[in-house]
């Protein structure tokens, strides 16, 4: 008994085409492009159907319906427009993903079509949704302004800065994603096997003010060549943030150096150093201070702590920083804080030290404050971000 | 002969991520149909939650939708479940199946409680 | 979503007779149907598919009809071992819904 003649579906069609269909003979269906082979809402990728003996087939036609994309992700800090048309998702459809401006970046241009594999695919034939990253490096600050010999910090000028606090130490550190913060190893070395117990705040001038961003550190990762009490060699850590900050005018990143800016740290140009840490009353600051200080000769720095201090080391993982007549410097309490530099091709502000150690005596002449020569790190820290 | 079979952790604590995998035998999932995540709270019905397609596409059940991701590993021929966020009220068996469910998992019972 | 009502709750037949279950959709849902049995303890078992496909392997007794909003799956002659929870399920539009099952008790 003949199985009645198949009627191909709209968009699609039947393969092979016999005059009659009969036990055990079968067809396929395929679609054309940009329609795929459904069963009421689910795909299949193929579609075969068998005569029986009764003279029916084995199984009920399929639909050929065009290929649907569905919503496109959301785009965390940015949002996607419809091109084609409101909410329109379907084969050949567009979208554009923008990120909210001035603060996050994308790579690409963000622009995304419907493809016959239903997938939204951007020109780079990237499946997965474009990345809004946050800018880096932005900041009101300028260089020549006259912590010790500083000035109190405008909003803006260092939306990177942030406050550590243990239960009876403060240090510094800086934001350098929207989840990592770059500090000294020195700095959170005691917390390092409990991290939840340091305090994070940033978006602030006043030590005190009671209007911060609080962040709470998932993990501390200090360098592995760092030993606590025996010199300041690889003296740096990178703290992850359980959750993403959200980037403002108040909270952003620095940029991590290029490496081109060596150039841009050579003896005599000038870094940007701030923090809480004391002033040259001796108290710790209440508002944010900066100082403005110009790379110091590396000979120089050595010779003057090998006899000042003999046995402690100025590493080539260091730089130095301060004026031979002293008056600037950072101090106790300023640990871990970002030492920045304006990269003049960019026009963005890129660390390139941390707060380490130096003299007791802080701002005194002929001793410069020593810093972790951020520049020598960069694989470390790309390493940390991407596996963790 | 196609075989399903579902594992992972029987006990989840409540506002933790319930994660099950799923694996194949004796058919690709990257071959043909859908693959589903069903599950059947007790004495309830049966609740379908999403499925991945033979082309890696997902389609979620809209209760669900922010808690749910369903992945895959193709060389491992599996597919799996994550449900973030759990309470008391995700306690079920969890069943996987491929569609049209001519095939099931024997299903998992996962209970969240502290 | 689309809601399957199943009717009745519970179905007491006597073995041998015939049992005639019934399923309503909220919505036209076409031919996008499937019945499933399930016993205690045991994940469910595929009858039918597509309203009134027979998958392989399962027996003639069982058979399916229906299209659009009214669907009902027959076991003409019930067997000790069809005694168990009967689930209607549409697959037509996402999400995907089953309905709440008709247990089968012996009368």
């Known amino acids: 008994r003949p199985c009645p003649d198949p009627t191909a579906p709209p968009n699609g069609s039947i393969s092979p085409v016999q005059a009659i269909y009969v036990l055990k003979d079968r067809f396929s269906v395929f679609c054309k492009t940009g329609f795929e082979l459904l069963q009421g809402s689910v795909p299949l990728k193929s579609f075969t159907a068998v005569c029986q003996k009764d003279g029916s087939w084995d199984r009920p036609m399929p639909e050929c319906s065009i290929i649907d994309c569905g919503p496109p992700d959301d785009l965390p800090n940015g949002h996607v427009d419809y091109i084609t048309g409101p909410e329109v998702t379907t084969y050949k459809a567009v979208i554009q993903y923008s990120c909210e401006e001035t603060f996050y970046t994308m790579s690409s241009n963000g622009k995304y079509v419907c493809e016959a594999d239903g997938f939204w695919t951007s020109s780079k034939g990237e499946k997965l949704p474009p990345v809004c990253e946050p800018v880096c490096g932005l900041s009101t600050h300028t260089i020549g302004g006259q912590i010790v010999g500083g000035q109190p910090a405008k909003p803006g000028d260092f939306p990177w800065q942030v406050l550590l606090l243990g239960q009876t130490t403060a240090a510094a550190g800086a934001l350098i994603h929207d989840n990592w913060v770059l500090t000294a190893a020195h700095a959170v070395y005691e917390k390092r096997m409990a991290a939840s117990s340091l305090n994070i705040r940033m978006g602030i001038l006043k030590r005190l003010s009671p209007h911060y961003t609080q962040a709470w550190p998932e993990e501390i990762f200090i360098h592995e060549g760092y030993t606590h009490g025996a010199g300041f060699d690889n003296d740096i850590a990178l703290i992850k943030l359980k959750n993403k900050v959200t980037i403002n005018g108040s909270i952003m990143p620095v940029c991590l150096p290029r490496k081109e800016a060596a150039s841009l740290m050579r003896t005599d140009f000038t870094g940007t150093v701030a923090g809480w840490g004391l002033t040259q009353k001796g108290l710790l600051a209440r508002n944010l201070m900066f100082v403005d200080i110009p790379i110091a000769d590396h000979q120089k720095c050595t010779a003057v702590y090998e006899k000042l201090y003999p046995g402690v080391r100025v590493s080539a993982n260091m730089l130095c920083a301060g004026l031979e007549t002293g008056g600037k410097d950072s101090c106790r309490g300023d640990s871990g804080g970002a030492l920045v530099f304006l990269d003049n091709e960019t026009q963005r502000w890129f660390v390139g030290g941390i707060v380490s150690w130096g003299s007791i005596n802080c701002g005194a002449a002929d001793q410069y404050g020593v810093y972790t020569k951020v520049i020598n790190y960069i694989p470390w820290i790309e390493n940390i971000i991407s596996n963790f | 002969q196609v075989q399903l079979q579902e594992s992972g952790p029987g006990l989840v604590k409540p506002s933790e991520t319930l994660s099950l995998t799923c694996t194949v035998s004796g058919y690709s999932i990257t071959s043909d149909y859908a693959w589903n995540w069903i599950r059947q709270p007790p004495g309830k019905k049966l609740e379908w939650m999403g499925y991945?397609?033979?082309?890696?596409?997902?389609s979620y059940n809209p209760s669900l939708k922010s808690r749910i991701t369903i992945s895959r590993d193709t060389s491992k021929n599996q597919f799996s479940l994550k449900l973030s966020s759990v309470t008391a009220a995700d306690t079920a068996v969890y069943y996987c199946s491929r569609h049209y469910g001519d095939y099931w998992g024997q299903g998992t019972l996962v209970t969240v409680s502290s | 979503e689309i809601v399957m009502t199943q009717s009745p709750a519970t179905l007491s037949v006597s073995p041998g007779e015939r049992a005639t279950l019934s399923c309503k959709a909220s919505q036209n849902v076409g031919t996008n149907v499937a019945w499933y049995q399930q016993k205690p303890g045991q994940s469910p078992r595929a009858l039918i598919y597509?309203?009134?496909y027979r998958y392989s392997g399962i027996p003639a007794r069982f058979s399916g009809s229906g299209s659009g909003t009214e669907f009902t799956l027959t076991i003409s002659s019930l067997q000790s071992e069809d005694f168990a929870v009967y689930f209607c399920h549409q697959y037509n539009a996402n999400p995907l819904t089953f309905g709440g099952g008709t247990k089968v008790e012996i009368k």
């Open positions: 991945i397609s033979y082309s890696g596409r997902t």
């Open positions: 597509s309203a009134s």
